[in-house]
């Protein structure tokens, strides 16, 4: 009799283990589905906002000529700002001309007013040269107005209609830039 009870108990325990395993598999499958769903939504959002509307820029981005710009609503240090832009398939803003600078500062005035916004400009610690993130040099009229008195790495930011410099570890808004989609029509 005792042996019989023991056998039943073991069988029940085995059944319980199998059910736990099944539940674990189901939970994993559910998590996987949720992740896939998240990717699909992000992908669809990206595709639809630009392709479906045949808009050259995603929603909440501003267009000027061949570029799309995103003005952040969060603060971060310069390096994190760069990574945030990369997540969006963009890089920190690279200002190529006075016309582009005027467009950016004009847009910022309309959107947010006089705040600090990181751009993709940093100062080489050894040579002291200012370089954009792709390695190119800024045109003479687009060099930061003041040299930051910082022992740390120095990065460029836009405020009002000026390009200034600051310790890269300070928190600021940032501006991302990506190429606008060309119309296939």
């Amino acid at each position: 009799k005792l042996l019989q009870v023991s056998t039943i108990a073991m069988q029940q325990q085995e059944k319980l283990i199998q059910q736990e395993r099944a539940l674990l598999n189901f939970t994993e499958w559910k998590r996987s589905c949720a992740l896939q769903m998240k990717y699909c939504q992000a992908f669809m959002q990206n595709s639809l906002s630009s392709a479906h509307n045949s808009s050259p820029c995603p929603n909440n981005w501003i267009q000027n000529r061949e570029s799309c710009y995103y003005v952040s609503e969060i603060w971060s240090i310069w390096h994190t700002s760069q990574e945030n832009c990369l997540k969006e398939g963009s890089t920190l803003l690279q200002i190529e001309s006075k016309e582009e600078m005027d467009f950016i500062t004009g847009s910022l005035r309309k959107i947010k007013g006089s705040y600090d916004y990181w751009v993709g400009l940093s100062q080489d610690g050894h040579s002291g040269r200012w370089l954009w993130q792709d390695g190119s040099s800024p045109s003479p009229g687009l060099l930061p107005a003041e040299r930051s008195q910082s022992a740390n790495q120095v990065c460029g930011y836009v405020k009002s209609n000026s390009l200034l410099s600051s310790n890269c570890s300070t928190w600021k808004y940032f501006i991302c830039e990506k190429y606008a989609l060309r119309s296939s029509v």
Partner: nanobody
């Protein structure tokens, strides 16, 4: 999920060159940019170079003019051409995929530059 596999690391003399490759597979449609990071012993992982799907590039100050990042969309592969290597470039180099929802990392490849 996205899988990233690095290759091309090794031992090279100062002044020499190496080309790292990172092959991506899986749900790669979710990736918007690809980058290379490095981590030297006792130091933080730092961004070396990155390239967006649109082809925009970004480089760390310390590698500008020496390293070049590129991509082959047909092969789903990103490359890091490293020239004029210095002993301070010695580190484990990691490939990273940037997406809106997640970040994906490769296992890393060791690069050692001897003087």
């Amino acid at each position: 999920q996205v899988q990233l596999q690095e290759s091309g690391g090794g031992l090279v003399q100062a002044g020499g060159s190496l080309r790292l490759s990172c092959a991506a597979s899986g749900s790669i449609f979710s990736i918007n940019s690809m980058g290379w990071y490095r981590q030297a012993p006792g130091k933080q992982r730092e961004l070396v170079a990155a390239i967006t799907n649109g082809g925009r590039t970004t480089y760390a100050d310390s590698v500008k003019g020496r390293f070049t990042i590129s991509r082959d969309n047909a092969k789903n592969t990103v490359y890091l051409q490293m020239d004029s290597l210095k002993p301070e470039d010695t580190a484990v180099y990691y490939c990273k995929g940037f997406s809106l929802t997640d970040d994906y990392w490769g296992q890393g490849t060791q690069v050692t530059v001897s003087s």
